[in-house]
Interface confidence: low
């Protein structure tokens, strides 16, 4: 079954900056990726970026740079400042839509024991939504 992985890293050089990387392990082509924080989009989360393979990328503060890393993975840099600054226990979620194969969403946050600039390798996260 396809899975989504989420990796969150705090930048060593800027402690208020985060890098979120998400990947889709399925075989289908991706039609839309939505990145949110504070929980899943639609369940209290706030959308940070939407990436469409043909129509481009849209992002909202404090997202600084969203981009495709591969055909099935994306990265997003967050630059915290003031009220919109992420904190260490912020939850970030990525939803990959690959209809009709399905839509999959997974969430992650900074590992509690992580030092700035360090992170665990990406690991598959639970499938939260599928069709």
């Amino acid at each position: 079954t396809p899975e989504v992985w989420v990796q969150v890293r705090m930048e060593a050089t800027e402690l208020s900056s985060f890098t979120i990387r998400c990947g889709f392990l399925g075989s289908g082509s991706i039609s839309l990726v939505t990145v949110s924080w504070g929980g899943p989009n639609g369940a209290g989360g706030t959308t940070l970026a939407v990436l469409h393979p043909e129509r481009g990328i849209r992002q909202w503060a404090p997202a600084r740079q969203a981009r495709w890393e591969t055909q099935s993975s994306i990265s997003l840099i967050l630059e915290g400042s003031g009220a919109s600054s992420p904190c260490a226990n912020t939850t970030f979620c990525c939803k990959f839509a690959s209809f009709p194969e399905g839509s999959w969403e997974a969430c992650g946050s900074l590992p509690p024991s992580s030092d700035p600039g360090l992170s665990a390798p990406p690991t598959p996260a639970p499938i939260l939504r599928a069709d």
Epitope: N41, A43, V50, H52, F99, P100, P126, I127, A130
Partner: antibody, heavy 115, light 107 residues
Amino acid sequence: EVQLQESGGGSVKPGGSLQLSCAASGFTFSSYGMSWIRQSPEKKLEWVAEISSGGTYTYYPDTVTGRFTISRDNAKNTLYLEMSSLRSEDTAMYYCARGDPFGYWGQGTLVTVSA
Amino acid sequence: DVVMTQSHKFVSTSVGGRVSITCKASQDVMTAVAWYQQKPGQSPKLLIYSTSYRFTGVPDRFTGSGSGTDFTLTINGVQAEDLAVYSCQQHYSTPRTFGGGTKLEIK
């Protein structure tokens, strides 16, 4: 063949409660997100709840948040919608549906809220 | 919330004709729009998803197009069994929202 069969509809007074069920067959229920959608007497469609495949996450529009609760029992291949503090505007045909967008729909169960 | 507007409540054509049903989103939803068909006394059925992709078993006379805020469902070679209400829905953001529906009448 994908089949979805709703039950539990009926008449209830304003402020009352009702639980709808949706029995699923013909596919691996635990692998799919599921939703409830309703259709008013004026035939307007409104999505009212969604639950993730494992039941971890639930989603609602503002119109039903705090009054409706979606849940599922993957061992029984059954989806539920618990409705409380019902209002006259909740009168509708309630459908369960698979996926996002909604690839398969049940035949619906009618809920009537009236004094 | 994204408001989906179908400005025409009714459209009419003859058997064998061609008809276009339009839908407008209140904001850019990229290509995340689906179309449903609901025949009298039946539940809705998914025809098109992601603007232009036909769902399983949908005849190729049904075609979807558009992007951003303006979307169209076109039925070529309309058949008598196509008599139904057609509704659009955005699957871009939560809450998922539907248009009010357009009824296809056969002359």
